[in-house]
């Protein structure tokens, strides 16, 4: 059957976490991606900037996990309002911000 | 000003029982989760018990489970916590303390108590 | 249980900057706090949820949580932050919430 909310939402926390704690080199050799405004559809728009990222196999688990959570289909270069759009900070950066809001979004319940 | 003032300390013999009570005042009460907390002389600290904001769900240490109950009273804003079948590892300084609610309860105790003395001896 | 694992003791002489780690199997999945506690006063909290830090506590204190290791660290030391310092998660899996057991920072 479908993976629980909750579930899927810790398992996206703890890959998050295993990206953060392997870095060696940069993440995705340094690239930058859009920041994001962490609120109501966040995953598709986490999604979206990632996407963007190619060539990078530490963040090919994340960008599937994703889009288990963003309703509609996401490709590279398709962008949403959600978007700070002049800001670009590293995936590394982006991981760690997202990771720390995905911790407290489960804390409080919200897992879709 | 916020604060918690915890009571009903004291020498107990082992088997017996003891009531602790927090008294709290100065925030709303209601909106928060409640936890006990003991640290045993020269010792850390070891959470106790937790218990919602609406009083519906309660979680206690394994080395307690069973022997120790915790309620409390939105309407007067007090906190307690029942003891019974005390044993000498139980003696501790016990504090009461505040912690934001959330759908789980994983935030930080921002509001402790001074603590009352608990000692279990024959 | 989840275990959270501290150094017992760390020395630091003033001005210096410390670092005490609080260990636990994939602790970057959780948010943690961590509380300072002096001789017979009661545990203050100094950074909650990781890396926030409350108003009264001073800028010198911060707070990372990263893979299997969280940090405390404290710059420009001084000998008003001598003290032990515990740090705290939420299990989920148990419905417990746990404590580090605690580190004694001595100022030198």
């Known amino acids: 059957g479908p993976v629980p909310p909750s579930t899927a939402l810790r398992e996206l926390i703890e890959e998050l976490v295993n990206i953060t704690q392997n870095q060696k080199a940069p993440l995705c050799n340094g690239s930058m991606v859009w920041s994001i405004n962490l609120t109501a559809g966040m995953y598709c728009a986490a999604l979206e900037s990632l996407i963007n990222v190619s060539g990078c196999s530490a963040i090919e688990k994340t960008q599937r996990m994703l889009s288990g959570f963003c309703p509609h289909k996401v490709s590279a270069g398709q962008f949403s309002s959600l978007h700070v759009r002049d800001t670009k900070i590293e995936v590394a950066q982006f991981v760690k911000d997202l990771l720390l809001h995905l911790k407290k979004l489960f804390r409080e319940g919200q897992f879709n | 000003q916020m604060q918690l003032v915890e009571s009903g300390g004291g020498v107990v013999q082992p088997g017996r029982s003891l009531r602790l009570s927090c008294a709290a005042s100065g925030f709303e009460f209601r909106t928060y989760g409640m936890h006990w907390v003991r640290q045993a002389p020269g010792k850390g600290l070891e959470w106790v018990a937790v218990i919602w904001d609406d009083g519906s769900n309660t979680h206690y240490a394994d080395s307690v489970k069973g022997r120790f109950t915790i309620t409390r009273d939105n309407s007067k804003n007090t906190l307690n916590l029942q003891m019974n079948s005390l044993r000498a590892e139980d003696t501790a300084v016990y504090y009461c303390?505040?912690?934001?609610?959330?759908?789980?309860?994983?935030?930080?105790?921002?509001?402790w108590g001074q603590g009352t003395m608990v000692t279990v001896s024959s | 249980s989840y275990i959270l694992t501290q150094p017992p003791s760390v020395s630091v002489a003033p001005g210096e900057t410390t670092r005490i780690t609080c260990g636990g199997n994939?602790?970057?999945?959780?948010?943690v706090h961590w509380y300072q506690q002096k001789p017979g006063q009661a545990p203050v909290l100094v950074i909650y949820d990781d890396s926030d830090r409350p108003s009264r506590i001073p800028e010198r204190f911060s707070g990372s949580n990263i893979g299997n290791t969280a940090t405390l660290t404290i710059e420009d030391v001084e000998a008003g932050d001598e003290a032990d310092y515990y740090c705290?998660?939420?299990?989920?899996?148990?419905?417990?919430?746990?404590f580090g057991g605690g580190t004694k920072l001595t100022v030198l």
């Open positions: 994939l602790i970057g999945a959780k948010l």
């Open positions: 303390v505040r912690a934001p609610q959330w759908y789980l309860t994983a935030e930080a105790f921002d509001l």
């Open positions: 705290q998660v939420w299990d989920y899996s148990s419905n417990h919430m746990v």
